[in-house]
């Protein structure tokens, strides 16, 4: 029978098929930066190249005895999970191992950097097919390790990293916190977050998705035919590295941005019990379990988007938060969220030639998040139109005035600090199609895009009664690009996108004193891409 | 994901009063020193000196050599363990933490990060 982890990530229609590149040869290469490995193990024999790379610190303790099977344990298991004959995700994939972890599973940032540089040098000396780098390790946040990952990713290498086993925010660890890395948390056979003793999988906005990481059967270094079970975010990352290898095997030209978007889009949604995570991390943590996506030929033309959360701004009066998309992605909308509701809104601005999503804290606020909606829109041409705040009592309107440009998102930023005097912004699909409308003291920003066959529409849902949140979803075939809250009550916490669902959050106290006439509205902008059609606004 | 995580960044910008050595002119360091927020994971004595992105190959070597020379002048022995050319410009150095102020004032230095442990997950 198929082990639970493989059954979980590989849909039934994929189980038997072999992933081959168009010319029939599987040319994807996976580099594993880990402990030494047992290359003669039956699971991986013949498909593993043990490089001469070795950059590890000395083992601690005077009574430490090097035992080959112990030294090779972690790396051998992961090599098996990636490309093992029986228990591997990408069974035919060739793998190169670099030793950056010693027999106690310890390495250094510097050793890892030298390992990444070794891969870059190999790539320069002998260019090959697609490269996947698996980093089943974690240390404290390291600016240079993250920067090295960024540089390597920009050469076309796909890096997959363990989120970490510290039951903590993955953003506090590297390489997990590197935006250019696909960061993987661990789930068990019940699709729940993995607990490891008193700790467990890391979580938070730096995690891209989860994958099986508990009781994973794989190659054991105890003997050449032995198997054993291991757990951790390393195992989860190895699954995703295997999935990526299979995706690249079929379609070697897929970019990092496309791979990440497809992994997110085709993952299993909403099966993880978010209560396991700390309350303040639940909204930031993706409820996604990886599965092998179908090829683009079977699902072509789909508009793919993901939500990117910024770091928390901090509580100072003028604190700002910034969320960025990957270089290949388009920032289609920007919203903000504050647990206290004290925020001064959000806007899109260009920094160093890249559009970024910004959010501003308000006086007395505990801080804000900026929430970017990052999408893959082929041949897109996007721009921001903004109008300064109107005088008291007047509405501010912004629409996409360029021909064939459609509205993909709205942002509102208030000049005034006093939350009591301002009416919050509104988006109206019926009276003013394709317009962002802001009220008193709000600067309004419209994100307008032109792309072949891009069409968009607004979808609203309002609730008058007490409710902590209002949601509106885009229907099948449509993708959520923008999400805003149009409040009837005095205080809203903000809005954000969860997959194809727009979530508008309301403050508890606001909920209590709301009159039935004041509806809080979640307003979603839903778009789709029909390559044959012209860009249009759908009413 | 993050630009700057929860880890220590220390500004070491104390101008050094050198005894008439022209190449050690006291230009104030704008570079920063960074280290792991978890003390037990730190590896004091080993540092990754990261240079500005546009730094040329020869300049990397010159900077490492300059650090060695200036350190030697003060009686410190340092070992350049590795020079990074291909992913980012910089070098790995084994030296006393006493020399961080000196190193941060070298031309082309963007920041210095203390080495730290990583662990199998």
């Amino acid at each position: 029978s198929i082990p639970w982890n493989l059954e979980r990530i590989i849909p039934a229609w994929h189980q038997t098929e072999e992933d081959r590149s168009p010319d029939g040869s599987s040319q994807v290469e996976v580099y594993l930066l880990d402990t030494s490995i047992q290359g003669a193990h039956r699971e991986i024999e013949g498909r593993v190249t043990i490089t001469d790379f070795n950059s590890v610190p000395e083992e601690d303790g005077t009574r430490f005895h090097r035992q080959a099977s112990k030294c090779d344990s972690h790396g051998t298991h992961l090599a098996g999970v990636v490309s093992g004959r029986d228990a591997g995700v990408a069974k035919g994939t060739s793998l190169h191992s670099l030793r950056v972890l010693n027999c106690q599973g310890k390495g250094t940032v510097s050793g890892t950097l030298i390992g990444l540089e070794f891969i870059r040098k190999s790539q320069l000396i002998q260019p090959s097919g697609p490269l996947v780098v698996l980093l089943p390790l974690a240390g404290g946040y390291s600016r240079i390790l993250n920067a090295a990952c960024r540089h390597l990713a920009r050469t076309g290498v796909v890096l997959v990293a363990a989120a970490g086993n510290f039951r903590d925010d993955a953003c506090l660890y590297s390489p997990a916190s590197a935006p250019e890395v696909i960061t993987v948390g661990a789930t068990n056979a019940q699709d729940q977050p993995v607990t490891l003793g008193t700790l467990g999988t890391n979580f938070g906005r730096c995690v891209d998705l989860f994958a099986p990481g508990k009781d994973i059967i794989g190659a054991s270094s105890d003997c050449s035919t032995c198997f054993m079970s291991q757990s951790g975010t390393s195992q989860a990352a190895a699954h995703v590295a295997g999935i990526v290898a299979r995706m690249l095997s079929r379609e070697p030209t897929l970019t990092l941005a496309e791979l990440r978007q497809r992994l997110i889009h085709f993952s299993t949604k909403d099966v993880i019990n978010m209560a396991w995570f700390p309350e303040d991390q639940q909204v930031l943590t993706p409820n996604l379990v990886a599965t092998l996506p179908p090829s683009t030929h079977e699902t072509g033309g789909q508009l793919l988007c993901r939500t990117v959360w910024s770091a928390h701004s901090g509580p100072t009066r003028t604190a700002t938060a910034t969320a960025r998309c990957a270089p290949e992605e388009e920032l289609l909308s920007c919203s903000s969220f504050s647990r206290s509701g004290r925020r001064r809104g959000d806007w899109i601005e260009a920094i160093g030639g890249q559009q970024v999503c910004k959010a501003l804290n308000a006086f007395g606020g505990e801080g804000v998040y900026a929430v970017a909606r990052c999408c893959l829109v082929p041949r897109a041409n996007c721009s921001i139109h903004n109008t300064p705040a109107a005088r008291a009592g007047l509405e501010t309107h912004v629409h996409c005035h360029q021909k064939d440009h459609v509205l993909t998102g709205c942002s509102f930023h208030w000049e005034v600090e006093d939350l009591s005097v301002r009416r919050q912004p509104a988006l109206r699909s019926r009276r003013q199609p394709g317009q962002c409308v802001g009220h008193q003291a709000a600067s309004v920003y419209a994100s307008c895009c032109h792309a072949p066959g891009l069409e968009c529409k607004i979808k609203e849902h309002g609730i008058s009664g007490p409710s902590e949140q209002v949601t509106v979803a885009c229907e099948a075939g449509w993708t959520l690009t923008g999400c805003n809250v149009l409040p009837g009550a005095s205080l809203t916490l903000g809005a954000y996108s969860v997959d194809n669902l727009c979530v508008a959050r309301v403050h508890d106290t606001a909920r209590a004193d709301r009159t039935s006439g004041e509806a809080t509205v979640a307003a979603a902008i839903c778009c789709r891409s029909r390559p044959s059609a012209k860009a249009s606004w759908v009413q | 994901q993050d630009e700057d995580g929860d880890y220590e960044e220390l500004m070491l910008a104390l101008p050094s009063q050198e005894d008439g050595l022209a190449d050690e002119a006291a230009h104030v360091a704008t570079a920063t020193f960074r280290r792991c927020s978890k003390e037990a994971w730190r590896l004091p004595g080993t540092y990754i000196v990261v240079l500005m992105e546009e730094t040329q190959r020869l300049q990397i070597e010159q900077t490492a050599h300059r650090l060695q020379t200036r350190a030697a002048r003060r009686g410190y022995v340092i070992k350049v363990l590795h020079i990074f050319y291909d992913l980012f410009p910089g070098f790995l150095v084994k030296m006393s933490s006493d020399l961080l102020g000196l190193a941060l004032k070298l031309p082309h230095v963007e920041y210095i990060e203390e080495d730290s442990f990583v662990f199998a997950q």
């Epitope: - | 050198e18 060695q68 030697a72 003060r74 009686g75 022995v77 006393s96």
Partner: antibody
Framework: QVQLVESGGGLVQPGGSLRLSCAAS????????MHWVRQAPGKGLEWVSN????????YYADSVKGRFTISRDNSKNTLYLQMNSLRAEDTAVYYC???????WGQGTLVTVSS | DIVLTQSPATLSLSPGERATLSCRAS???????LAWYQQKPGQAPRLLIY???SRATGVPARFSGSGSGTDFTLTISSLEPEDFAVYYC?????????FGQGTKVEIK
């Protein structure tokens, strides 16, 4: 200009103690490693001990380990060598030297004799 | 420990002659940390050469240093009367810091 002046030498009985000082001026004392080097009468130079600029790192020659202690007071620009359990073979002129041994003091004579 | 052996122990030369002093290490020495000193009776040593080949401030050009690994040389191209003294080589790249036993350059 750079100046190093040793003091504290003298005659001491075997087993006795002595504390040498080296007053530094003309440079940023705390930036530099400082060393003690000795020279027995008619003999060559022998390195004794050194200390890093911050005082956090110290090294000793095997011949003095456990008996001598090097220290510094950066606020006073002074280097010290505490010598305990002195032996006849410790008799020498003791020099302090800066950094890469580019400046030396004039030396102070320590005589260990009964 | 790195043992430095200087040869010859004594060098008898006349002013104007070339002096070649040798220093051999028991193991490879990082040349950045190889120095030569001059010492005259009743005086403290004076740094002549650091980094195996760089002249210290105020040292006349007739003094030059060379070598790497385990073999190092101090050359005085043309001896002046004030050059007659004892010369020491030293390595300070490894602890313990060690000196050679010295070469005495005397007037012939």
């Amino acid at each position: 200009q750079v100046q190093l002046v040793e003091s504290g030498g003298g005659l001491v009985q075997p087993g006795g103690s002595l504390r040498l000082s080296c007053a530094a001026s003309g440079f940023t004392f705390s930036d530099y490693y400082m060393h003690w080097v000795r020279q027995a009468p008619g003999k060559g130079l022998e390195w004794v001990s050194n200390i890093s600029g911050s005082g956090s790192t110290t090294y000793y020659a095997d011949s003095v380990k456990g008996r001598f202690t090097i220290s510094r007071d950066n606020s006073k620009n002074t280097l010290y060598l505490q010598m305990n359990s002195l032996r006849a073979e410790d008799t020498a002129v003791y020099y302090c030297a800066r950094g890469m041994f580019d400046f030396w003091g004039q030396g102070t004579l320590v005589t260990v004799s009964s | 420990d790195i043992v430095l052996t200087q040869s010859p122990a004594t060098l008898s030369l006349s002013p104007g002659e070339r002096a070649t002093l040798s220093c051999r290490a028991s193991q490879s020495v990082n040349s950045n940390y190889l120095a030569w000193y001059q010492q005259k009776p009743g005086q403290a040593p004076r740094l002549l050469i650091y980094g195996a080949s760089s002249r210290a401030t105020g040292v006349p050009a007739r003094f030059s240093g060379s070598g790497s690994g385990t073999d190092f040389t101090l050359t005085i191209s043309s001896l002046e009367p004030e050059d007659f003294a004892v010369y020491y080589c030293q390595q300070w790249g490894d602890v313990p810091i060690t000196f050679g036993q010295g070469t005495k350059v005397e007037i012939k």
